[in-house]
């Protein structure tokens, strides 16, 4: 079989809050009932993981309460919320997904969305 | 299905030899990255050797450069993993992974693996 194909969106610009939104969709070769996604963050080569959450098809995603990330789903497809983020934040976001139920498991990786994330200018002194 | 399939493995005394081989079966992409863990019981699993199929970037764990050659034979999808030099500390059971990347991913990264085969040991002891 082939890979499994991961589609998300090239670019993205988080807003002035630090948070940006991207679909991830995945052509699922098979009737996952259990799949997990990872988002993972690369920056000079360096890899690391940014969040996770494994999910039953029809129910929400849920992630872990210090998490950064939330998320749903709707089909083969993941709507990813990252908050928090700052201008050194910025890089490759990765999208890996794991169908892990039924047999056979299947792994798909994404080409990344490169989000850029701009700190706001903090606003000027008043003498009001 | 992607099936990986180890073999090779086995007990050799310390600084002896073994080669061992890793068939890839189920997968059609020409793209990916293959390569050679280790874990010990209650570790870690541990990236030893890595090779990219397309152009052939290879990494190593600092711990194994110059005792260790990974190499493959595309025709073959098969992977190998020369050992020389082989110490006490070099056992371990020995995985075959596979990362299903793009010329996008960092080489050999171990976050981007998921398919695994079943497993090899090697155990070195006099």
């Known amino acids: 079989c082939k890979a499994m194909h991961v589609a998300q969106p090239a670019v993205v610009l988080a807003s002035s809050r630090g948070i940006a939104s991207f679909v991830c969709e995945y052509a699922s070769p098979g009737k996952a009932t259990e799949v997990r996604v990872t988002v993972l963050r690369q920056a000079d080569s360096q890899v690391t993981e940014v969040c996770a959450a494994t999910y039953m098809m029809g129910n929400e995603l849920t992630f872990l309460d210090d998490s950064i990330c939330t998320g749903t789903s709707s089909g083969n497809q993941v709507n990813l919320t990252i908050q928090g983020l700052r201008a050194m934040d910025t890089g490759l976001y990765i999208c890996k997904v794991e169908l892990m139920y039924p047999p056979p498991y299947y792994l798909g990786i994404g080409n990344g969305t490169q989000i850029y994330v701009i700190d706001p200018e903090p606003c000027p002194d008043s003498d009001f | 299905e992607v099936q990986l399939v180890e073999s090779g493995g086995g007990l050799v005394q310390p600084g002896g030899s073994l080669r061992l081989s890793c068939a890839a079966s189920g997968f059609s992409s020409d793209y990916y990255d293959i390569g050679w863990f280790r874990q010990d019981p209650g570790k870690e699993r541990e990236m030893v050797s890595c090779?990219?199929?397309?152009?052939?970037?290879?990494k190593y764990a600092d711990s194994v450069k110059g005792r260790f050659t990974i190499s493959r034979d595309n025709s073959k999808n098969t992977v190998y993993l020369q050992m020389n030099s082989l110490r006490a500390e070099d056992t371990a059971v020995y995985y075959c992974?596979?990362?299903?990347?793009?010329?996008?991913?960092?080489?050999?990264?171990?976050?981007?693996?998921?398919?695994w085969g079943q497993g090899t040991r090697v155990t070195v002891s006099s």
């Open positions: 992974g596979l990362a299903p990347i793009s010329p996008v991913h960092a080489v050999c990264n171990q976050h981007y693996f998921g398919y």
């Open positions: 090779i990219r199929s397309s152009g052939g970037s290879t």
